[in-house]
C-alpha cells in the first residue's frame, strides 16, 4: 500500500525530518509549511492549524522559502553615482552597481555600497592597468618614445611618430612634430595626425590598447582603493 500523505501540520516520525518547504516548529512540535518567496509568516502554526503566510509589505522582501515573522527591508535607493541593476521586489533586494566611469570601492553581499570615480591619468602618464568593476585605474609615466596628451581613465601611452626631419621633438605629453617634406605617411590607428611623417612605426612596439571598462554587476569581494598613483588626477 502507498504511504499515506501527511498534510501539515503533522508530527514527524521519531528521529525523522520535515519535508522540503516545511520546517519543524519547536513550540507546536510539528512539521509546518514554510512561506514562499515574497511572503512571510503572519501566524505561526499550532498543533491543529498550519502557518498563515502574508505578502511582504512595501519595500520589503524574502528571497527564500521561510518562516520569518517579518520580511527583510530592501536597501536604500541607489545613489547618484550608481545604477539600479535589480529593483526591490517582494522576492528580491535592490542591487546597486557603479555607473560607467566609476568602480566599486566597497562591496556588499550583492552590488556595491560605495562607488568611487575611476582615476584619470594626466598628460605624460598612461593607463598601466585599466579599471574594473572593483579596482581603480593604475597610471604609469610614459616611457621614452611614447606620450599621452590626454587626461583619461582609458588612454595608454602611444609611440611618437617617426619623422624624416623633426620640427619639434616629442616628449611624454606631446607627440613629435615633423617638418612638411614628403606626403607619405603610415600611422598606427589612433595616432595624432600632425604634419607629414614619412616612415612607419615598425621599430616601436605598439602597446595593446587596454579595454575601456564600464563597471557592471560584480559580486566579487572588494579590492580596496589603491593609493593615488603618480600622474593621476582626482576628478
Amino acid at each position: 500500500l502507498p504511504a499515506q500523505v501527511a498534510f501539515t501540520p503533522y508530527a514527524p516520525e521519531p528521529g525523522g525530518t520535515c519535508r522540503l518547504r516545511e520546517y519543524y516548529d519547536q513550540t507546536a512540535q510539528m512539521c509546518c509549511s514554510k512561506c514562499p518567496p515574497g511572503q512571510h509568516a503572519k501566524v505561526f502554526c499550532t498543533k491543529t492549524s498550519d502557518t498563515v503566510c502574508d505578502s511582504c509589505e512595501d519595500s520589503t522582501y524574502t528571497q527564500l522559502w521561510n518562516w520569518v515573522p517579518e520580511c527583510l527591508s530592501c536597501g536604500s535607493r541607489c545613489s547618484s553615482d550608481q545604477v539600479e541593476t535589480q529593483a526591490c521586489t517582494r522576492e528580491q533586494n535592490r542591487i546597486c552597481t557603479c555607473r560607467p566611469g566609476w568602480y566599486c570601492a566597497l562591496s556588499k553581499q550583492e552590488g556595491c555600497r560605495l562607488c568611487a570615480q575611476l582615476r584619470k591619468c594626466r598628460p605624460g602618464f598612461g593607463v598601466a592597468r585599466p579599471g574594473t568593476e572593483t579596482s581603480d585605474v593604475v597610471c604609469k609615466p610614459c616611457a621614452p618614445g611614447t606620450f599621452s596628451n590626454t587626461t583619461s581613465s582609458t588612454d595608454i601611452c602611444r609611440p611618437h611618430q617617426i619623422c624624416h626631419v623633426v620640427a619639434i621633438p616629442g616628449n611624454a605629453s606631446m607627440d613629435a612634430v615633423c617638418t612638411s617634406t614628403s606626403p607619405t605617411r603610415s600611422m598606427a590607428p589612433g595616432a595624432v595626425h600632425l604634419p607629414q611623417p614619412v616612415s612607419t612605426r615598425s621599430q616601436h612596439t605598439q602597446p595593446t590598447p587596454a579595454p575601456s571598462t564600464a563597471p557592471g554587476t560584480s559580486f566579487l569581494l572588494p579590492v580596496g582603493p589603491s593609493p593615488p598613483a603618480e600622474g593621476s588626477t582626482g576628478d
Epitope: 505578502s55 512595501d58 519595500s59 527591508s73 529593483a87 526591490c88 535592490r94
Partner: antibody
Framework: QVQLVQSGSELKKPGASVKVSCKAS????????MHWVRQAPGQGLEWMGR????????KHDPKFQDKAVLSSDTSVSTAYLQISSLKAEDTAVYYC?????????????WGQGTLVTVSS | DIQMTQSPSSLSASVGDRVTITCTAS???????LHWYQQKPGKAPKLLIY???NLPSGVPSRFSGSGSGTDYSLTISSLQPEDFATYYC?????????FGQGTKVEIK
C-alpha cells in the same frame, strides 16, 4: 509619460454614495500601489488607504475602514474609491497617488484631484 | 498611529531667505520612509524630497532634507518666488501612514 487622470467633480446629498475613478497611463500597474488621500477645504492631507492593483490587497486608515472601499480594474488601468454614507464633513478634494514598490511609500505622481461636495 | 508635527505652522519670508521647516514624529521613523511634499493652492501635492534627503529629478538643488529617528527637517537655501507654497512631511514607516499638518510659506 506617467499620468493619473481622475473623474470630475461630484455634488451629492447626505447619505448617498460616490465613486471616484483614477485612470493610470504611462506605466505598468505591476509593482505599484495606488493611494487615496483626501484634503478638506483649507485643511491638510489625510491618507485614507491604498490598493495593490496586481493583487487587489487593500490597507486602510482604520478611520476610513467602514467608509471607503478601494478597488481596481487592471484591464482598464483604473483604480476606484467608493465612499458611502456621505456626510457634510466628507466634502473634500480626493486625490489618487501612486507609489512604486520599493520606493518606501514615496508618492511620485498624483492625480489632479476630484472635488466631492456633500450638501442637502 | 505615528503623529507628525511640523513647525512652524506658517512663516513669512522674503525672496533669497534661508528657510528651515522641522517635522517631529511621535515615535521613531526610519529615514528611508520619510518624505516631503510641496503643494500650491488649487494644485495636487508634488513629491519634493524622498527618503529624508533625496531629490527627484527636476527638483532644484536649493531644497535639501536631513534628519533621523524622530527629528527631520526641510531647508530651502535661497527662497525663490515659486517656492511660496505649503509643505508637508509624510511617514510611511508604520500604517496608518500619516502627514504633518503642513507649513505654509508666505511672502513677507
Amino acid at each position: 509619460q506617467v499620468q493619473l487622470v481622475q473623474s470630475g467633480s461630484e455634488l451629492k446629498k447626505p447619505g448617498a454614495s460616490v465613486k471616484v475613478s483614477c485612470k493610470a497611463s504611462g506605466f505598468n500597474n505591476k509593482d505599484i500601489y495606488m493611494h487615496w488621500v483626501r484634503q478638506a477645504p483649507g485643511q491638510g492631507l489625510e491618507w485614507m488607504g491604498r490598493i495593490d492593483p496586481a493583487t487587489g490587497n487593500t490597507k486602510h486608515d482604520p478611520k476610513f475602514q467602514d467608509k471607503a472601499v478601494l478597488s481596481s480594474d487592471t484591464s482598464v488601468s483604473t483604480a476606484y474609491l467608493q465612499i458611502s454614507s456621505l456626510k457634510a464633513e466628507d466634502t473634500a478634494v480626493y486625490y489618487c497617488a501612486r507609489s512604486p514598490y520599493g520606493d518606501f511609500g514615496a508618492m511620485d505622481y498624483w492625480g489632479q484631484g476630484t472635488l466631492v461636495t456633500v450638501s442637502s | 498611529d505615528i503623529q507628525m508635527t511640523q513647525s512652524p505652522s506658517s512663516l513669512s519670508a522674503s525672496v533669497g531667505d534661508r528657510v528651515t521647516i522641522t517635522c517631529t514624529a511621535s515615535s521613531s521613523v526610519s529615514s528611508n520612509y520619510l518624505h516631503w511634499y510641496q503643494q500650491k493652492p488649487g494644485k495636487a501635492p508634488k513629491l519634493l524630497i524622498y527618503s529624508t534627503s533625496n531629490l527627484p529629478s527636476g527638483v532644484p538643488s536649493r531644497f535639501s532634507g536631513s534628519g533621523s529617528g524622530t527629528d527631520y527637517s526641510l531647508t530651502i537655501s535661497s527662497l525663490q518666488p515659486e517656492d511660496f507654497a505649503t509643505y508637508y512631511c509624510h511617514q510611511y514607516h508604520r500604517s496608518p501612514w500619516t502627514f504633518g499638518q503642513g507649513t505654509k510659506v508666505e511672502i513677507k
